[in-house]
Every structure is written in C-alpha cells, then in structure tokens.
C-alpha cells in the first residue's frame, strides 16, 4: 500500500476523502484533516504539511485549503441565537430565538420570524421540534378554552363549578370559561361572564 505522496498515472487517488491529485507532479497527496489547513504543499518527496486553524476559524472537512474559514456569530438581527460555539472543526451552530420560527432556509436556517398568534378558541399544534415551522393553530378540544390571541397560550380545561361548591351559570365555550355562581344567589344581568363567590 503506497503512502502519500505516490505517483498516479490515471489522475485518481485511492482515498478520495483524504487524498487529492496534484497535477503538477502527477502525484496523490494527503488532504488536511478537519480543524487544519495546508501550511506547505506537497512535493514528490514530501507530503502535505498541515497546521491547526487559528482561533476564531475552522475547516469542517478533509481539505487542501490554504486558509481556514472565519467563524461567524449567529445574527440576532435575523432572529438567530447560538446553540454551540465555533470550534476549529465546525462553524457556530445557530437556531431561532424563542418565540420565532425559521422563515428562510439555505443549507441552514438564515432568517427567523415571530410565530403567528393563535386566536381565541385555538392553540398551536405541538410539534416535535419547536421553531422550525410557523404555528399551525388547531381548535381547543371539547371541554377546553383559550381566550387570548397568543403564539404560545394553551387551551385550559373548563372550570368545574361543582368542585368549588358552585353551580353553573353559563356553559364554557372554546373561547371562554364556564361561569359559576353561588347556588343561593341569582345571577344579576350585569354580572354575567364573571364568577361570583
């Protein structure tokens, strides 16, 4: 098994991930591993010399780059925040800030926007992964209500008047809670929609 640098007549190398063809000398040379770059190119008698990327720079893959890529921070103007810092082997990992979702994708998320409000009577459908898509609002299930316009409010169960020693004055809806009243008092018209103790 030849070790780089070795001659290649057909311009291909055995390990394409970790070697590359150098046409000037017609040889296969080693690429540099992640986290490093080429500090000295190979020759017929000497393989590639690699050096570690300087602080705040990285190379993710086996490469024969003569520079490292500059680390870039997550852009808060685009609604992004950091998950993990840049290292010599990987760029900064970003995600959308809380309350936002990814509205534009390249290879990675590039721009986040505020999650849409869900209107009263609905809630955002729970997803496995928060933030990678906008809210999809679904109606509150039977016996539950939600009375605000909010991206994150959850439907709550209707109050059970009997659990508080009260009686029902008005049934709950998807947008409002049950109205309870003291069983001994009539409900005045101006007090409808409130709970009387």
């Amino acid at each position: 098994q030849a070790v780089p640098p070795y001659a290649s007549e057909n311009q291909t190398c055995r390990d394409q991930e970790k070697e590359y063809y150098e046409p000037q000398h017609r040889i296969c040379c080693s690429r540099c591993p992640p986290g490093t770059y080429v500090s000295a190119k190979c020759s017929r008698i000497r393989d590639t010399v690699c050096a570690t990327c300087a602080e705040n720079s990285y190379n993710e893959h086996w490469n024969y780059l003569t520079i490292c890529q500059l680390c870039r921070p997550c852009d808060p103007v685009m609604g992004l925040e950091e998950i993990a810092p840049c290292t010599s082997k990987r760029k900064t990992q970003c995600r959308c800030q809380p309350g936002m979702f990814c509205a534009a994708w390249a290879l990675e998320c590039t721009h986040c926007e505020l999650l849409s409000d869900c209107p009263p009577g609905t809630e955002a459908e729970l997803k496995d992964e928060v933030g990678k898509g906008n809210n999809h609002c679904v109606p509150c299930k039977a016996g539950h209500f939600q009375n605000t316009s909010s991206p994150s409010a959850r439907c709550q169960p209707h109050t059970r008047c009997e659990n508080q020693g009260l009686v029902e004055a008005a049934p709950g809806t998807a947008q409002s809670d049950t109205t309870c009243k003291n069983p001994l008092e009539p409900l005045p018209p101006e007090m409808s929609g409130t709970m009387l103790m």
Epitope: K91, R95, C102, E108, C109, D128, E129, G133
Partner: nanobody, 120 residues
C-alpha cells in the same frame, strides 16, 4: 447513534438520470435535517441539497437547481436525491449527511458515500 447507508450510484451517460437513496437506522430520524453533499475528484466537499424533518425547508446548490430533487420518506427512514439531466461535472462521490439538531449548521452524521460517474 445514526447510521447512514447510500445506494444508487453508478455510471450514467450525460443527460441521463439516477436516483440516490440514503437509508437511516438508529435513533429517531424524523427531527433531523438531512442533506446530500458531493466531492468531485480534486475538489472540496460541497452541499448539493438539504431538506427538513417535514419535507419543507429545501435547499439546492445553484449548480443543481431545476435538475436535482431531494425528498424524504420518514416511514421508511430514507432520503432520496433524484438527479436528472446529469452532466460530466456532476461526477463525484455523493454523501448523505444528518444534522441531529435539525438546524442545518452542523452535519454530525455521514454515510460512506456512493460514486456517481457521468461519462459517455
């Protein structure tokens, strides 16, 4: 730990088509952002296409737009790359990759690659 196995590579004439598959096994696959990268002889590795857990958020490199289509079947834990109107410059080893955070900023799982050769 996720294992990725690519298949579907081979020799094809210019203008022809190929469909690459990437089968994932191991941990939950549905929340991952998946991508296809390629490395041509003597070139650096480059991203070709990417897709979100739900089939949205697709990305294509300019060089393949309108010719390549990425898709996924979560029931089969498989990602596909349909390659049409292939050109000699598409010759490369194609790698499937997965980003476990789902955000696409670091692909931490890689397959071994499948070779695509476009030549007459």
């Amino acid at each position: 730990e996720v294992q990725l196995v690519e298949s579907g590579g081979g020799l094809v004439q210019p203008g022809g088509s190929l469909r690459l598959s990437c089968a994932a096994s191991g941990r939950t696959f549905t929340n991952y952002r998946m991508a296809w990268f390629r490395q041509a002889p003597g070139k650096e590795r480059e991203a070709v296409a990417a897709i979100n857990w739900n089939g949205g958020g697709t990305y294509y490199a300019d060089s393949v737009k309108g010719r390549f289509t990425i898709s996924r079947d979560n029931a089969k834990n498989t990602v596909y790359l349909q390659m049409n109107s292939l050109r000699p410059e598409d010759t490369a080893v194609y790698y499937c990759a997965a980003d476990s955070t789902g955000w696409g900023s670091y692909f931490d799982y890689w397959g071994q690659g499948t070779l695509v050769t476009v030549s007459s």
